[in-house]
Amino acid sequence: AILGRSETQECLFFNANWEKDRTNQTGVEPCYGDKDKRRHCFATWKNISGSIEIVKQGCWLDDINCYDRTDCVEKKDSPEVYFCCCEGNMCNEKFSYFPEMEVTQPTSNPVTPKPP
């Protein structure tokens, strides 16, 4: 392991569309990949009238946008589908939304997912 880097070996897995996709609904997913590539966890969710609906969680590929992020945080302003990624085992268990706004101070909207 490289000093100071959290290596990702497994992530929380969730698929809201599990019946159609014929996968498990939830579990722990081992993350594979080439030895020279970094691995990450991700979470995607929707905000339907203030209610959080998780879409997918799992392992993600080597992505510079995820490097050295121990927390899973979406920074885009009001996307249709929220996405965050992070490094470290099961780092996608919790995710949050901190929109990057030019003028106003970002507000914390932490989410602790509770899959059905």
Epitope: D21, G58, N65, F83
Partner: antibody
Framework: EVQLLESGGGLVQPGGSLRLYCAAS????????MSWVRQAPGKGLEWVSA????????YYADSVKGRFTISRDNSKNTLYLQMNSLRAEDTAVYYC????????????WGQGTLVTVSS | DIQMTQSPSSLSASVGDRVTITCRAS??????LNWYQQKPGKAPKLLIY???VLQSGVPSRFSGSGSGTDFTLTISSLQPEDFATYYC?????????FGGGTKVEIK
């Protein structure tokens, strides 16, 4: 070096069957999901089918569901596509491609094998 | 199924030109958008995944952007070897779908 080599293509009559093979090397085959993608002459890419690394989960495009069956033998590092009830519109170059995890892209592709369905 | 619409279907450009190809998804696909390059008689090659991440070995003149439903592939300065057909693809759904392709031809 990652290599994917398709075989089994050829000329078949409408209603006939064909089995395609994809021999994989240079990576841990069982750790990757695999897909078949086809391209009709002069047309774009069409995803056909996919299978998880373990082989437990399979997925099909509506256009081939019930006629094609994807399978794999991880001990032989080989992916298969059994094609039954073939139609003229199934004529295409068939590519196999690997995918690390379900939301990932298809990062390596074979060179393809041509299937021609004609009487 | 998620539909992917690419435009234009073809374009003519000269070496050194800046080229932009767009791809629209019929529903939000987050960052699960990939771009491929295909040359005649060859297999497709992965260029970009996750909207903007360059696959190993892909020149930095290629870039990707967008989010949600609207995405863009940009070639900052077209090179002779870039004349090819480009496809977008969504991997948000387990049932993959590709755009119809954009053929980049020499003007």
């Amino acid at each position: 070096e990652v290599q994917l080599l398709e075989s089994g293509g050829g000329l078949v009559q409408p209603g006939g069957s064909l089995r395609l093979y994809c021999a994989a090397s240079g990576f841990t085959f069982g750790a990757y999901a695999m897909s078949w993608v086809r391209q009709a002459p002069g047309k774009g890419l069409e995803w056909v089918s996919a299978i998880s690394g373990s082989g437990d989960d399979t997925y099909y495009a509506d256009s081939v569901k019930g006629r094609f069956t994807i399978s794999r033998d991880n001990s032989k590092n080989t992916l298969y596509l059994q094609m039954n009830s073939l139609r003229a519109e199934d004529t295409a170059v068939y590519y196999c491609a690997r995918q690390l995890i379900p939301p990932a892209p298809l990062d390596y592709w074979g060179q393809g094998t041509l299937v021609t369905v004609s009487s | 199924d998620i539909q992917m619409t690419q435009s234009p279907s073809s374009l003519s450009a000269s070496v050194g030109d800046r080229v932009t190809i767009t791809c629209r998804a019929s529903q939000g696909i987050s960052r699960f958008l990939n771009w491929y390059q295909q040359k005649p008689g060859k297999a497709p090659k992965l260029l970009i995944y996750g909207v903007s991440v360059l696959q190993s070995g892909v020149p930095s003149r290629f870039s990707g952007s967008g989010s949600g439903t609207d995405f863009t592939l940009t070639i900052s300065s077209l090179q002779p070897e870039d004349f090819a057909t480009y496809y977008c693809q969504q991997s948000f759904s387990s049932l993959f779908t590709f755009g119809g392709g954009t053929k980049v031809e020499i003007k």
